[in-house]
């Protein structure tokens, strides 16, 4: 189920690559974020907190990613026309509850100007 299109700029282009921004509420402490291209899982990142507030970050499908207190950025490089597709951020919230899964996304358009060495 698609909950909605992202209500923010999801794609940031730079140097022939793209940063895909997946946001989550900043009160969330433990979650899994997956990046889907169409129905295929490209990347995932899981953040958990153990005893003593020890943070653990795990990836089963590894992509270059960056975590902040309210977003996960996934980076795709060497863009070509085959990257044009619907991309979705699949967020599973574990803590604080309730458990919640949301799917938000948008279409990544690839233009010639973004294929190489362009800064946006």
């Amino acid at each position: 189920e698609i909950n909605g299109s992202a209500n923010y700029e999801m794609f940031i282009f730079h140097n022939g690559g793209v940063q895909i921004l997946c946001k989550y509420p900043d009160i969330v402490q433990q979650f899994k974020m997956q990046l889907l291209k169409g129905g295929q899982i490209l990347c995932d990142l899981t953040k958990t907190k153990g005893s003593g507030n020890t943070v653990s970050i795990k990836s089963l499908k590894f992509c270059h990613s960056q975590l902040s207190n309210n977003s996960v950025s996934f980076f795709l490089y060497n863009l070509d026309h085959s990257h044009a597709n619907y991309y979705f951020c699949n967020l599973s919230i574990f803590d604080p509850p309730p458990f919640k899964v949301t799917l938000t996304g948008g279409y990544l358009h690839i233009y010639e100007s973004q294929l190489c060495c362009q800064l946006k």
Epitope: N7, P25, K49, I93, D95, P96, P97, P98, T102, T104
Partner: antibody
Framework: QVQLVQSGAEVKKPGSSVKVSCKAS????????MHWVRQAPGQGLEWIGL????????NYNQKFQGRATMTVDKSTSTAYMELSSLRSEDTAVYYC??????????????WGQGTTVTVSS | EIVLTQSPATLSLSPGERATLSCSAS?????MHWYQQKPGQAPRLLIY???KLASGIPARFSGSGSGTDYTLTISSLEPEDFAVYYC?????????FGQGTKLEIK
């Protein structure tokens, strides 16, 4: 039905502490986190903090850090908020509110009826 | 801290009229929620995620906006709608409420 029932009104002396309770019913207590919010007389609403019943993780508004303590008793499905070193400005109605998520954000979907705390010498 | 400024502070209208309440954020927020509060009662959720209607809330209530400017609209006022309305943002810590708009009968 889903209900949050809070403890009765309290009158406290400056410098003392107050502990407000919030008993949940009509849902599985550990499946939701709990927030605390207060409203001073004739004023707006102010977020105090959140406790995860699942992990006991707490998140406090910096303004209340060190003075507010949120706890839960899973056996009785009750959340507590204790405020210490009370001063007259803490006179307010204190509410518990259940955490929920939409597609983009979080909100309070169910509220307790409120507990009036009066701080007076 | 993100400051939410609601306007007007008081809105005097008659039943059947349309009410437009505004909430302006001091910096951009991802979404806004709206609560209604009647005297002696706890707040009640009306709108979440900017535009989604909470369970049991009549369709005459609607929400819109983005960035720093958000609006709650009541298309045709009913007698039970006269109350205080608060906007709330949960996207920038510490999470904050607006000061409220009192909707009163003209």
């Amino acid at each position: 039905q889903v209900q949050l029932v809070q403890s009765g009104a309290e009158v406290k002396k400056p410098g003392s502490s107050v502990k407000v309770s919030c008993k949940a019913s009509g849902y599985t207590f550990t499946d939701y986190a709990m927030h605390w919010v207060r409203q001073a007389p004739g004023q707006g609403l102010e977020w105090i903090g959140l406790i995860s019943i699942y992990s006991d993780h707490t998140n406090y508004n910096q303004k209340f850090q060190g003075r507010a303590t949120m706890t839960v008793d899973k056996s009785t499905s009750t959340a507590y908020m204790e405020l210490s070193s009370l001063r007259s400005e803490d006179t307010a109605v204190y509410y518990c509110g259940r955490n929920n998520y939409g597609n983009y954000g979080w909100y309070f979907d169910v509220w307790g009826q409120g507990t009036t705390v009066t701080v007076s010498s | 801290e993100i400051v939410l400024t609601q306007s007007p502070a008081t809105l005097s209208l008659s039943p059947g009229e349309r009410a437009t309440l505004s909430c302006s954020a001091s910096s951009s927020v991802s979404y806004m929620h709206w609560y209604q509060q009647k005297p002696g009662q706890a707040p009640r959720l009306l709108i979440y995620d900017t535009s989604k209607l909470a369970s049991g809330i009549p369709a005459r209530f609607s929400g819109s906006g983005s960035g720093t400017d958000y609006t709650l609209t009541i298309s045709s006022l009913e007698p039970e709608d006269f109350a205080v309305y608060y906007c709330f943002q949960g996207s920038g810590y510490p999470y904050t409420f607006g000061q409220g708009t009192k909707l009163e009968i003209k």
